[in-house]
């Protein structure tokens, strides 16, 4: 499955377990293995342009998860979410106008 | 056609108790979220309690935290409010609604209301 | 919990007008912010969802934007039916709050 597909489905998903169950544990446990995937690093030419449009952004989006189950600060949380909610807008956009 | 039909609101005495229904067509209520919101007459709204009809995760307002019970009952599409040790402050129309996501965007709100049931405490 | 402030009130205009309402978060709800428009008697309806989406069926008239914890509902050309109360909404965190409501007058 691609990248953007799997961030999709994912965001979707932790979406659903934080703002409708307010499940923030099965959130984090739904995006972890997303951040894992990024973190080992692109192996083809559409990982790569996927890891150039939205690394960055979802790597600081893991920092303030991480401060987050430091702090406990719903603040961390929203800044996370902030940067989530931007990548899939540009993510479903992209998707929409290539399908 | 979406919709949610409440009822069960009326007149009780401070101390009563009541239970509000809130019955649900058109949509998979299985897999839905369902909030109530009240508003007391010529004032703005306030959010009461929610409920995954799935889970069961539910979430309350502190102003009702430890007298009101939101349930749902998923082979009859109806969630419900138990309102009990009511006070003349609960004095509402009490709406339910169903919390939504959408395409493009992670963030939820609520996408279909019912009509609304007036709840009066007074002695 | 995040109080939402809206403004103003109230406000009188004409049909033709072009109206802005604002609603300022204690802290930062992300884009997690809908507007609603409530009229006597009725429940409200969904206008506006994540702070700049427009509703399926609600007329282009009406739209939304974000600045920081600030947001802003505008219709662009006030319509008799217009008339009513809106409300914002945030849905990042528990309790979800909403603005105290802007009534909406025939001046």
């Known amino acids: 499955i691609l990248w953007h597909e799997m961030w999709h489905e994912g965001l979707e998903e932790a979406s659903r377990l934080y703002f409708g169950e307010r499940n923030v544990k099965g959130m984090f446990e739904v995006l972890e293995p997303l951040h894992a995937m990024m973190e080992r690093g692109p192996q083809t030419l559409k990982e790569t342009s996927f890891n150039q449009a939205y690394g960055r952004d979802l790597m600081e989006a893991q920092e303030w998860c991480r401060k987050y189950m430091k702090s406990g600060n719903v603040k961390d949380l929203t800044q996370a979410w902030d940067l989530y909610y931007h990548v899939f807008r540009r993510i479903s956009k992209h998707h929409h106008h290539h399908h | 056609e979406v919709q949610l039909v409440e009822s069960g609101g009326g007149l009780v005495q401070p101390g009563g108790s009541l239970r509000l229904s809130c019955a649900a067509s058109g949509f998979n209520f299985y897999s839905s979220y369902i909030h109530w919101v009240r508003q007391a007459p010529g004032k703005g709204l306030e959010w009461v309690a929610s409920i995954s009809s799935s889970s069961g995760s539910t979430s309350y307002a502190d102003s009702v935290k430890g007298r009101f019970t939101i349930s749902a009952d998923t082979s009859k599409n109806t969630a419900y409010l138990q309102m009990n040790s009511l006070r003349a402050e609960d004095t509402a129309v009490y709406y339910c609604?169903?919390?939504?996501?959408?395409?493009?965007?992670?963030?939820?709100?609520?996408?279909?209301w019912g009509q609304g049931t007036l709840v009066t405490v007074s002695s | 919990d995040i109080q939402m402030t809206q403004s103003p009130s109230s406000l009188s205009a004409s049909v033709g007008d072009r109206v802005t309402i604002t609603c300022r978060a204690s802290q930062s709800v992300s884009s997690a912010v809908a507007w609603y428009q409530q009229k006597p008697g009725k429940a409200p309806k969904l206008l506006i969802y994540s702070a700049s989406s427009l509703y399926s069926g609600v007329p282009s008239r009406f739209s939304g934007s974000r600045s920081g914890t600030d947001f802003t509902l505008t219709i662009s050309s006030l319509q008799p039916e217009d008339f009513a109360t809106y409300y914002c909404q945030q849905s990042i965190h528990y309790p979800l709050t909403f603005g105290q409501g802007t009534k909406v007058e025939i001046k």
């Open positions: 609604a169903r919390f939504s996501s959408y395409y493009y965007t992670l963030y939820w709100a609520m996408d279909y």
